[in-house]
Interface confidence: low
């Protein structure tokens, strides 16, 4: 806590200015109105405070407001972000993408941290959905933001959000994840063309059914061994011999190297030998 | 402060295996993706292989898929590269890089280790 | 694969110059472009990443632009530490492609 002192004669600060870094903390606090201070928190990020001083900023403006900051000063906060507790961001409404990006920014290049957590819990619960935009927003900002929801949490993201993910914003879902995902991303590319969809469904394909890895193999799709071994076992087993021959196309050959990992070893395992045999790559079941 | 050190370069016979070591410290190593990319003698950079932070999933180029084989172990803080079948195209230095938490470029990568196939 | 074409593979330039290097990949990529700079028997390091933002540490006489499939690094007063090798790279999609590279010499 800064001790309540009287203002000396002739510091009582008009505006937010450059002059204010000379002031020592008690100094901050008895010269620099907090109302003042709310109104023209954008100029804060434009002198160089140090942390100190911009405890005693934050500290006028949680006197300020003890119920939380108003979205208005919330947009304009900057690098005082980065002086927030979560205890703090939780009593916050976030409504504006603006301020979110704003707030990001500050953060960027670092690991997400438990302050920019709380604040996209708070937009998120705010905005009922994870919708495209917002989506958008904090996958450009963390790629791997997606996979740190859990499947409850994924199951409220819209199938028209899909559009905004990108293959390695899948890179650490697990297969709970991906089986909330794969049916939305399934409905979001429904309608386009074979070779199209196939593009953008691929790297949801590891909470693919069965019945959708047989609908494939008719597509003649050439899929990859990495996606091919991203499936569920699950949903492998069943497929045929002939079937995983479509589906792999000129791939199919690299089950080979595969033999000895799931969900190759497993599918191998349920084939008859003969079946095996006409693809010539010598498995054995 | 980040810092990757590669070893287990060197020079070994076409057909022959190798297997490269990345030590990552200064970082919480198991949030960050991470990738191999390689520079083959006086030409330009090319990526190799990725992982993800579990390390469930891995990406390949073309030109070593099959061959190659990208790992990690969170405990000890280390990027492996298992390289079999060598060919002289993959005489090169490689490098390990860390892919950045907000984005997917890398910003910090190794000093490298050169890798020589010849007979 | 997404191929990405740098232009020119090689300048000449003076201290003080501006320099402008240009990158274009085969097939839409957003934003997400990074540039490195290269030194002779060193490790690439970073300096543009999602197109425009500068990597901690790096001056801001580097800047980046561009979205879509063409984007441009720019050194605005070249300086004897900035003579190196440039090289863009993709990563919207795997396989992650680089340009060939952009070797700025002294003139």
């Known amino acids: 806590e800064v001790e309540k002192t009287a203002c000396p004669s002739g510091k009582k600060a008009r505006e937010i200015d450059e002059s204010l870094i000379f002031y020592k903390k008690w100094e901050l606090e008895a010269c620099v109105d907090a109302a003042l201070l709310a109104t023209q928190m954008d100029r804060v990020n434009a002198i160089p405070f140090t942390y100190e001083q911009l405890d005693v900023l934050k500290h006028k403006l949680d006197e300020l407001y003890p119920q939380g900051y108003p979205e208005s000063v919330i947009q304009h906060l900057g690098y005082l972000f980065l002086k927030m507790s979560p205890e703090d961001i939780r009593k916050w409404n976030v409504t504006s993408l603006e301020t979110l990006k704003a707030l990001l920014e500050v953060n960027k290049g670092h690991e997400m941290s438990p302050q920019v957590a709380t604040l996209i819990d708070r937009f998120v619960k705010g905005r009922g959905q994870l919708d495209k935009d917002t989506l958008d927003t904090l996958t450009a900002f963390y790629p791997g933001y997606l996979c740190s929801l859990s499947p409850e949490e994924l199951s409220s993201v819209p199938p028209s959000s899909i559009w905004a993910v990108r293959p390695q914003d899948l890179d650490t879902c697990d297969p709970r994840q991906l089986d909330v995902l794969y049916p939305k991303a399934r409905l979001a590319f429904q309608n386009m063309n074979g070779s199209e969809y196939f593009v953008k469904i691929q790297s949801f394909l590891g909470g693919a059914p069965t019945e959708d890895l047989k609908a494939l193999s008719q597509q003649n799709v050439s899929m990859d061994l990495a996606t091919f071994m991203k499936l569920r076992t699950d949903a492998v087993l069943p497929l045929t011999v002939a079937e995983v021959q479509k589906l792999l196309g000129p791939h199919v050959e690299g089950l080979k190297a595969e033999e000895r990992h799931r969900p190759v070893r497993d599918w191998i395992l349920r084939q008859r030998q003969d079946d095996l045999d006409t693809l010539g790559l010598g498995l054995q079941g | 402060e980040v810092q990757l050190l590669e070893s287990g370069g060197g020079l070994v016979q076409p057909g022959g295996s190798l297997r490269l070591s990345c030590a990552a410290s200064?970082?919480?190593?198991?949030?960050?993706?991470m990738t191999w990319v390689r520079q083959a003698p006086g030409k330009g950079l090319e990526w190799v292989s990725g992982?993800?932070?579990?390390?469930?999933?891995?990406y390949y180029a073309a030109s070593v898929k099959g061959r190659f084989t990208i790992s990690r172990d969170n405990s000890k803080n280390t990027l492996y590269l298992q390289m079999n079948s060598l060919r002289a195209e993959d005489t090169a230095v490689y490098y390990c890089?860390?892919?950045?938490?907000?984005?997917?470029?890398?910003?910090?990568w190794g000093q490298g280790t050169l890798v020589t196939v010849s007979s | 694969d997404i191929q990405m074409t740098q232009s020119p593979s090689s300048l000449s330039a003076s201290v003080g110059d501006r320099v402008t290097i240009t990158c274009r990949s085969s097939?839409?990529?957003?934003?997400?472009l990074a540039w490195y700079q290269q030194k002779p028997e060193k490790a690439p390091q970073s300096l543009i990443y999602a197109a425009s933002s500068l990597q901690s540490g790096v001056p801001s006489r580097f800047s980046g632009s561009g979205s879509g499939t063409d984007f441009t690094l720019t050194i605005s007063n070249l300086q004897p530490e900035d003579f190196a090798t440039y090289y863009c790279?993709?990563?919207?999609?795997?396989?992650?492609?680089f340009g060939g590279g952009t070797k700025v010499e002294i003139k």
């Open positions: 992982i993800s932070v579990s390390g469930g999933i891995t």
């Open positions: 790279q993709q990563y919207n999609s795997y396989p992650l492609t």
């Open positions: 890089a860390k892919r950045g938490a907000a984005v997917g470029s890398f910003d910090y």
């Open positions: 097939q839409g990529i957003g934003s997400w």
């Open positions: 200064g970082l919480t190593f198991r949030s960050y993706a």
